[in-house]
């Protein structure tokens, strides 16, 4: 419940300044506090609107101040109301003229249902008139003028809730402005009972605390706190947690405190009288000085706090031995908590002596709902209450309050909870490319609905027609490749964003569907690439017999090694060759092929070939004659690639012999790079020529090489490396 306090200073109005201050003590932001005239209690009071101002000394307080000259307009009943969402708390009070003919014994009087009650007014002015008593502005009783006693009483032998109200007394010739008021509050239940059926037993409220008939909680008088009101506040403080302070020179002197029903109004501890300006007599303390100190062991009696017990003693009269009580403290609770919508288990941790119990720790939501712990444990020094909010949502954001109320006192700690909306992508991911077993995806994680920052992203995928769970991969980039997919399968894709904090996984975003390609056929077998002319190459392969009924074709890709020139050719599947034309002479080409249906097949290995040359071949280079014996010698050479060299010719003759007496050795495999001449004469000089042939003609040797064989007895020279034809 909201801690609302109305300070009436002073209820008896003379020609001094007087005021009403309404304080919403503590932590919760409220709808505006209102102060108004209580026409329910007194219908015929002054109608003037009140000038309500903000109390600058307090965050949540409103004030009405009447200057001396307005004194005549003040008489009447007033209320202060505070609201928290569904809950409205109204505190009532009255103001009356100090010069009234009668004065009430007390401003309010709280009784239990069934009590024997006397409402009394003290006669302060003697007049030769009848006395009249009204309830809520309606006449109920009169006393003939010669019978008006010093104490005018209304007797209710068996008080009922309907007896509650504002009772006023005056002489018959008087009016509202000479009336005295007192308010009777009748608890809905009999003494010490509470609950809808009044069948629960109240906690024993000490120091004149009052048991609330709806909640069973003690409403503590100003200056006391805790579950049983046993704990005295520090000097001149008040409020449910003793956080508010009386700023007067003499503390709370002249402040009448009015609290929610059924408490009513009283002085702060240490003060008494209708104006709360009289100090307690020795031996008395508490609100209205109604409590008597009966301190054991000669302990001191303080009019504000009661018995001041020595260490090791406790209780109202210091009658119990035991460890000194310690006001609870809330620990380890941050001022601000960011929570993801979903399940939430807030924790309140508190110290104190005695340690707070399960029932003494609560959590108050911003809408005023009071939660009780779902789980509870304690160590030697701390109690820990764990609350469960099955589903916290953004409207639950705001100031929450951990509240601990023990016999040793009460403490409240406000903290701010910010409930975040889990992120969800607005768009489905896009499929950039697919194969039979992979897909390239743009996850399109932005824009998204909800709160960031995004901690991680998951790409979820599953086959559409399988009752499989969603699989996922963590992704860091917007572009991601999904591998190991099934061919010719429809998949669903979506993206889930994860924000920081527990339970930060957002809803998956919109779903995209795509289908993987079928598995491709193997490449054609027996591929062969040969030059056909200076501008054509011929590619051949074995006939293809596909296993399915699907139409198919052969795709041939050719590209030039020397130039950036590529072409893809589609060949009907029933053919077994293709002529690649419009090529450049003397150029090397790389060719590969695959068999495609609706799905693309696998590429073959690369094949390379040169188109035929358009010029004579260059002369073989690096010609060497070695390993010469008496009857043989090895000739080696190198040739340049790309001139369509089909054969090498070695021509030799004995030096000095005629040209027509030469021997030609034609080597038709152009990859052979050395040859052994045999059957030579010993100790003979030979002239050797070597030249290359291609489709255009032969190369022209620039000069001849000489070879002299050895005498028959000599060993041969070393042989060079390379392919050799014997």
């Amino acid at each position: 419940a909201m801690d609302l306090i109305l300070i009436n200073s002073l209820p008896l109005v003379s020609d001094a300044e007087t005021s009403l201050t309404c304080i919403a003590s503590g932590w919760r932001p409220h709808e505006p506090i209102t102060i108004g005239r209580d026409f329910e209690a007194l219908m015929n009071q002054h109608q003037d609107p009140l000038e309500v101002t903000q109390d600058v000394t307090r965050e949540w307080a409103k004030k009405v101040v009447w200057k001396r000259e307005k004194a005549s307009k003040i008489n009447g009943a007033y209320f202060c109301e505070g609201r928290v969402r569904g809950e409205a708390i109204r505190i009532r009070t009255m103001k009356m003229r100090q010069q009234a003919s009668f004065l009430p014994a007390t401003l309010t009087m709280t009784v239990d249902k069934g009590d024997n009650v006397n409402i009394s007014f003290k006669k302060v002015l003697i007049k030769e008139e009848d006395a009249v008593i009204y309830k809520n502005g309606s006449f109920i009783h009169s006393v003939p003028r010669h019978e008006v006693p010093d104490i005018l009483e209304v007797h209710l032998p068996h008080a009922q809730p309907q007896d509650a109200g504002v009772y006023s007394a005056r002489y018959i010739g008087g009016n509202l402005f000479t009336s005295a008021f007192t308010r009777l509050i009748v608890r809905r239940c009999e003494a010490q009972k509470w609950g809808p059926e009044c069948n629960h037993l109240c906690t024993a409220c000490m120091n004149n605390g009052v048991c609330h008939e709806d909640t069973g909680e003690c409403i503590c008088p100003p200056g006391f706190m805790g579950r049983t009101c046993e704990k005295a506040c520090e000097l001149h403080t008040f409020g449910r947690t003793c956080k508010e302070r009386c700023s007067g020179q003499e503390g709370c002197k002249s402040y009448v405190f009015c609290l929610p029903d059924p408490y009513g109004c009283s002085c702060a501890t240490g003060w008494k009288g209708l104006q709360c300006n009289e100090a307690c007599h020795p031996g008395f303390y508490g609100p209205d000085c109604k409590l008597r100190c009966s301190c054991n062991n000669g302990e001191m009696c303080d009019r504000f706090q009661g018995c001041l017990c020595s260490p090791g003693w406790q209780g109202l009269q210091c009658e119990r031995e035991g460890i000194q009580r310690m006001t609870p403290k809330i620990v380890d609770l941050p001022d601000h908590i960011e929570v993801n919508s979903g399940k939430f288990n807030p924790i309140c941790k508190a110290s104190g002596w005695p340690l707070p119990t399960n029932e003494e720790m609560t959590l108050v939501k911003p809408d005023g709902t009071v939660l009780h712990p779902k789980d509870f444990n304690h160590t030697d020094h701390f109690s820990v209450a764990i609350f469960t909010i099955h589903r916290i949502l953004p409207p639950d954001s705001g100031v929450w309050v951990c509240s601990v109320n023990t016999v040793a006192g009460m403490v409240e700690k406000p903290f701010n909870i910010s409930v975040k909306v889990l992120p969800k992508p607005l768009n489905a991911p896009n499929v950039i490319d697919t194969g039979h077993n992979f897909a390239v995806i743009n996850i399109s994680s932005e824009p998204y609905f909800g709160d960031g920052p995004i901690k991680s992203k998951k790409l979820l995928y599953k086959p559409v027609n399988h009752y499989e769970a969603w699989q996922h991969i963590q992704v860091t980039n917007e572009i991601v490749t999904l591998n190991y997919l099934e061919p010719r399968t429809e998949y669903e894709l979506c993206v889930q964003l994860v924000r920081r904090g527990e339970g930060g996984e957002g809803h998956p975003g919109p779903v995209r569907r795509f289908t993987t390609a079928s598995i491709g056929l193997p490449p054609p077998r027996g591929l062969n690439l040969l030059p056909k002319s200076q501008t054509t190459l011929n590619l051949t392969w074995q006939p293809i017999f596909p296993s399915s009924e699907d139409d198919f074709y052969v795709e041939v890709e050719r590209r030039s090694v020397q130039k950036s020139d590529q072409q893809n050719i589609k060949v009907p599947g029933n053919l077994t060759s293709v002529l690649l034309n419009n090529l450049h002479p003397r150029e090397q080409y790389v060719v590969r092929a695959r068999v495609n249906t609706k799905a693309q097949g696998e590429w073959s290995e690369d094949l390379t070939a040169w188109t035929l040359s358009d010029i004579l071949p260059p002369q073989p280079e690096n010609i060497k004659i070695s390993n010469i014996t008496h009857s043989s010698a090895v000739i080696s050479w190198t040739i340049l690639d790309g001139y369509s060299i089909s054969s090498i010719t070695i021509r030799y003759k004995v030096q000095g012999k005629n040209e027509d007496q030469h021997v030609d050795v034609k080597i038709k495999n152009a990859t052979i790079t050395q040859y052994q001449l045999k059957g030579l004469e010993p100790e003979t000089a030979y002239q050797v020529d070597i030249f290359a042939e291609n489709n255009i003609g032969s190369s022209n040797p620039a000069f001849s090489h000489e070879l002299v064989t050895l005498p028959e007895s000599q060993a041969p020279a070393d042989l060079g490396g390379g392919k050799m034809l014997l």
């Epitope: 809950e87 099955h390 949502l393 809803h507």
Partner: antibody, heavy 121, light 107 residues
Framework: QVQLVESGGGLVQPGGSLRLSCAAS????????MSWVRQAPGKGLEWVSA????????YYADSVKGRFTISRDNSKNTLYLQMNSLRAEDTAVYYC??????????????WGQGTLITVSS | DIQMTQSPSTLSASVGDRVTITCRAS??????LAWYQQKPGKAPKFLIY???TLESGVPSRFSGSGTGTEFTLTISSLQPDDFATYYC?????????FGQGTRLEIK
Amino acid sequence: QVQLVESGGGLVQPGGSLRLSCAASGFTFSSYAMSWVRQAPGKGLEWVSAISGSGGSTYYADSVKGRFTISRDNSKNTLYLQMNSLRAEDTAVYYCARGVDSSMVTGFDHWGQGTLITVSS
Amino acid sequence: DIQMTQSPSTLSASVGDRVTITCRASQSISRWLAWYQQKPGKAPKFLIYEASTLESGVPSRFSGSGTGTEFTLTISSLQPDDFATYYCQQYEDYPLTFGQGTRLEIK
């Protein structure tokens, strides 16, 4: 143990009004969100309205918005449903149901026995 | 509004059978789903919340699974007491909505 007892059902003419009550016991009433759920004869369940533990927040199904008002009195541990402008299609058993906790959007872990409302001329 | 669709509408089974009831949401509801059992003339009984968490006191033969839009309630070995109507309910957002119910009858 948790108990929810509905009352206030009966026969009412179209256009008439009725107020249902649900008396709760066995738990801290003010700490729980509460709902009304109805079930037309031979039909499925239909959520009608919900209210937060403090009474500060309320929600309604479109079919009853503007006609029904949910409220609670935490001092009496009682939930109410004020039904105005009743129609034949409002005929149903009305259940009072407790939310799993203070959360406004939850399942219902405890239900009353239901009270029948018949709207007919 | 989020639509909840249960299948099948009626299910015939025998004591000892394993049965599965499916509930589909028209949009993702994460894990915010509850299951109830209702017998004729009685109030619904809370079985499962958060799609898979068993309410205390509910026999372990009942189990729930699913997330997003597809959910299932499974009874591993049917007992005579299990023949009733079962409802799913989403609590992702207002208005709270129930499935149309699945009647589980004796074969």
